[in-house]
């Protein structure tokens, strides 16, 4: 921001009323008046260039310093070319001297040169030559000097002429302030510029109404430079929750809008499924039946638990069931849907039921499922199972009701045996198998069916109560199709998949385990 100038003395604006002291009186500096555009222009002039040993002084009135520490002196003046005078006027000068003196009281007409300290020799950038002077084209010069630090109650300025032809049209003395400033929603008071050029006065700002320093943020500070400029802003304020920045102020969020934290963002419109907020709201309450999870941002619409999964199917495959379902028709407005599967088994004879989580195996953990299918295995044959699939989302925990769908399935068969080739020779194959232990008590015998691959007209069957069998009298180097099926009191169980096993060729004979 531009520096603010506080004027202590303005000769040009005073209209010749200041009555400065001249010494010697009347013979050196004197006040003159000119009319320009029907307005009087006053100037102090001196032009005793033909006389040697000039020592003419012009002293201002006493100027009260007030709060100024460093003053700036702006001079507007003309200087005539010494060559305008005969022989270049050997005693003629083209400069004058600027002095100041501090004092705690006004000395009035008591003028003492010895009290004055020289500030500088003032030289013009442009001198006015004869032709310009006669054509009224005088060259106006502007020079600025500064003095500080000042410590007394007031001061005088003085101008010493030593034989120049000078007209002093303007003497303006001022000090600089960094102006009152609103920046970054912080108010910085008007501050007097310091007196020492390298120093920057640190000024603390105060947050405007309804603004705060953000957590972990720096308090607002600025630096007031000697020239009255604000520099190096540090920190800032932000509009608090429920308020937004409008120009340089924080304004309450309008009804129907909210802001949940101190930030630079504007107020946001209340999201879907919320009630209209009052002015200055930090959040918007949810409509009845809608909720906000603890981790949900205030900007997110309120949501509700999902409806039940859609189209739940249970497809039995021996002692396995594949459960499939489709997502709920109503997600509740959320994407964080998970599913939980629970299992209940019932004995057909007694109708007694109980949980079966401990005895069955799921293809993946049955709680927190994100996919819409799961396979349940290790089911016991001739049992009735009921599966429940519950859909949940981030707000399900906020209500007591549950959204679930159930499917029942009866297991009529054992699970297919898992078959392994244990060993082989040119004429035999040793085969073993296993089924889940809970089902083994139900099995009466195992039936092993085998045939040559490609021969669909004949097959052989072997029955055994054990978990292995050696198939003899086989042809060498021949592939056989082998299947194992459990037999229960109620009938056949599920058959294993058909395996292809090959006997050894005569060259590589010997009973080799695989």
């Amino acid at each position: 921001a531009q520096g603010k100038e506080v004027v202590l003395l303005d000769f040009a604006a005073a209209g010749g009323e200041l009555g400065w002291l001249t010494h010697p009186y009347g013979k050196g500096w004197d006040l003159m008046q000119n009319i320009m555009n029907d307005m009087p222009i006053y100037m102090y002039s001196v032009c005793n260039v033909m006389s040697g040993d000039q020592d003419n002084w012009l002293r201002t009135n006493w100027v009260y310093r007030g709060e100024a520490e460093r003053i700036f002196i702006e001079l507007k003046f003309t200087v005539r070319d010494c060559n305008s005078f005969p022989g270049g006027a050997s005693s003629c000068k083209e400069t004058f001297n600027l002095y100041y003196a501090e004092s705690d009281l006004d000395y009035g007409t008591n003028f003492q040169k010895r009290l004055f300290t020289k500030i500088d020799t003032i030289a013009p950038d442009e001198i006015t030559v004869s032709s310009d002077f006669e054509a009224r084209h005088v060259k106006l010069n502007v020079e600025e000097r500064s003095v500080g630090p000042l410590t007394r109650k007031g001061f005088y300025l003085a101008f010493q002429d030593i034989g120049a032809c000078v007209a002093l049209l303007s003497v303006r003395v001022y000090y600089k302030k960094c102006p009152e400033l609103l920046q970054g929603l912080a108010h910085f008071p008007e501050t007097i510029a310091g007196s020492d050029a390298p120093s920057l006065a640190t000024v603390a700002g105060t947050c405007v109404d309804h603004a705060v320093v953000p957590p972990g943020g720096e308090e607002p500070r600025m630096h007031c430079a000697v020239d009255g400029e604000w520099l190096v802003p540090i920190g800032q304020c932000l509009c608090q929750a429920g308020y937004e920045k409008v120009e340089d102020a924080c304004q309450a969020c309008s009804p129907g809008f909210f802001k949940f934290e101190a930030s630079e963002s504007p107020c946001l419109e209340c999201p879907e499924h919320t009630l209209p907020s009052p002015e200055g709201a930090t959040s918007c309450e949810c409509e009845e039946g809608f909720f906000r999870a603890p981790q949900d941002p205030a900007s997110m619409p309120c949501t509700r638990p999902p409806s039940a999964p859609h189209y739940l199917t249970a497809v039995g495959m021996g002692a396995k069931v594949e459960l499939r379902w489709t997502p709920p028709q109503d997600s509740g407005g959320r994407e964080d849907i998970v599913y939980s599967v629970t299992c209940e088994q019932c004995w057909p004879e007694s109708g007694e039921c109980g949980p079966c989580e401990a005895s069955v195996r799921y293809s993946e953990p049955p709680h927190g499922l994100t996919r819409t299918s799961v396979t349940v295995s290790d089911l016991e044959p001739h049992m009735n199972y009921t599966f429940t699939v519950e859909a949940r989302n981030g707000v399900s925990g906020l209500v007591t009701s549950r959204s679930f769908r159930t499917a029942s399935v009866s297991i009529n068969q054992t699970e297919p045996p898992k078959v392994r080739l244990e060993g082989r020779s040119t004429t035999s194959l040793s085969v073993s198998w296993s089924i889940p232990p809970p089902q083994q008590s139900r099995v009466w015998k195992y039936e092993v069916t085998y045939r040559k691959k490609g021969d669909s007209n004949s097959y052989n069957v072997r029955r055994t109560e054990g978990f292995s069998v050696t198939l003899d009298d086989l042809a060498p180097d021949t592939t056989y199709l082998v299947q194992v099926q459990a037999l229960t009191q109620e009938g056949q169980g599920a058959g294993s998949k058909v395996h292809e096993f090959q006997t050894l060729s005569p060259e590589g004979s010997g009973n080799l385990a695989v």
Epitope: G19, T22, K27, L31, Q33, C47, S51
Partner: antibody, heavy 120, light 109 residues
Framework: QVQLVQSGGGLVQPGGSLRLSCAAS????????MHWVRQAPGKGLEWVSV????????YYADSVKGRFTISRDNSKNTLYLQMNSLRAEDTAVYYC?????????????WGQGTLVTVSS | SSELTQPPSVSVAPGQTVTITCQGD??????ASWYQQKPGTAPKLLIY???NRPSGVPDRFSGSSSGTSASLTITGAQAEDEADYYC????????????FGGGTKLTVL
């Protein structure tokens, strides 16, 4: 209105004294330098003396220096010229005049003049 | 002797333009002021500074300066302009405070 009214002129013998007065009205007397200018019969204008607004500074033409004294009473808005050791060549119409700005003029307001005759 | 020199007399026909000059070293440094004096009356300020007229002075009166010379010009002189005219300037030599020219008698024929 702005005016200067003079009094005190007259006939005086050589070596004698006379005090001229100039009463100001219509302006802030204490803000202006005041001058005396004289005009010998049939001659031109001759500057005599000046006094600063507060009365702290005075100057005289060489021809009257040491014999004439300029003074003012700002409380009475009056300018004076005390003339001592008068000579025949001091015979003139004496005018008081106001310097419109600064010490040296221009002279924008003039009194009506008062005749001083020095003769035996 | 006066340090500002004027011609003792100048004449002009009514309606004509006349110029009265004033010579002196001080005029290099300071502007001249011009006064009109009619018989039996106090002088009256006509021109001061670069070319400034106090209110009430007709605009047929104008002033100019060049080097050591200052001029008063009456454009379209009138009978009532017949009077004595004096130039005046600050003294740049330091000998005097202010000096008058010897005066010029203007006759309007």
């Amino acid at each position: 209105q702005v005016q200067l009214v003079q009094s005190g002129g007259g006939l005086v013998q050589p070596g004698g004294s006379l005090r001229l007065s100039c009463a100001a009205s219509g302006f802030t007397f204490s803000s202006y330098a005041m001058h005396w200018v004289r005009q010998a019969p049939g001659k031109g204008l001759e500057w005599v003396s000046v006094i600063s607004p507060a009365g702290t500074n005075t100057y005289y033409a060489d021809s009257v220096k040491g014999r004439f004294t300029i003074s003012r009473d700002n409380s009475k808005n009056t300018l004076y010229l005390q003339m001592n050791s008068l000579r025949a060549e001091d015979t003139a119409v004496y005018y008081c005049a106001r310097a419109s700005v600064g010490a040296t003029g221009p002279f924008d307001i003039w009194g009506q003049g008062t005749l001083v005759t020095v003769s035996s | 002797s006066s340090e500002l020199t004027q011609p003792p007399s100048v004449s002009v026909a009514p309606g004509q333009t006349v110029t009265i000059t004033c010579q002196g070293d001080s005029l290099r440094s300071y502007y001249a002021s011009w006064y009109q004096q009619k018989p039996g009356t106090a002088p009256k300020l006509l021109i001061y500074g670069e070319n400034n007229r106090p209110s009430g002075v007709p605009d047929r009166f104008s002033g100019s300066s060049s080097g050591t010379s200052a001029s008063l010009t009456i454009t379209g002189a009138q009978a009532e302009d017949e009077a004595d005219y004096y130039c005046n300037s600050r003294d740049s030599s330091g000998t005097h405070l202010t000096v008058f020219g010897g005066g010029t008698k203007l006759t309007v024929l």
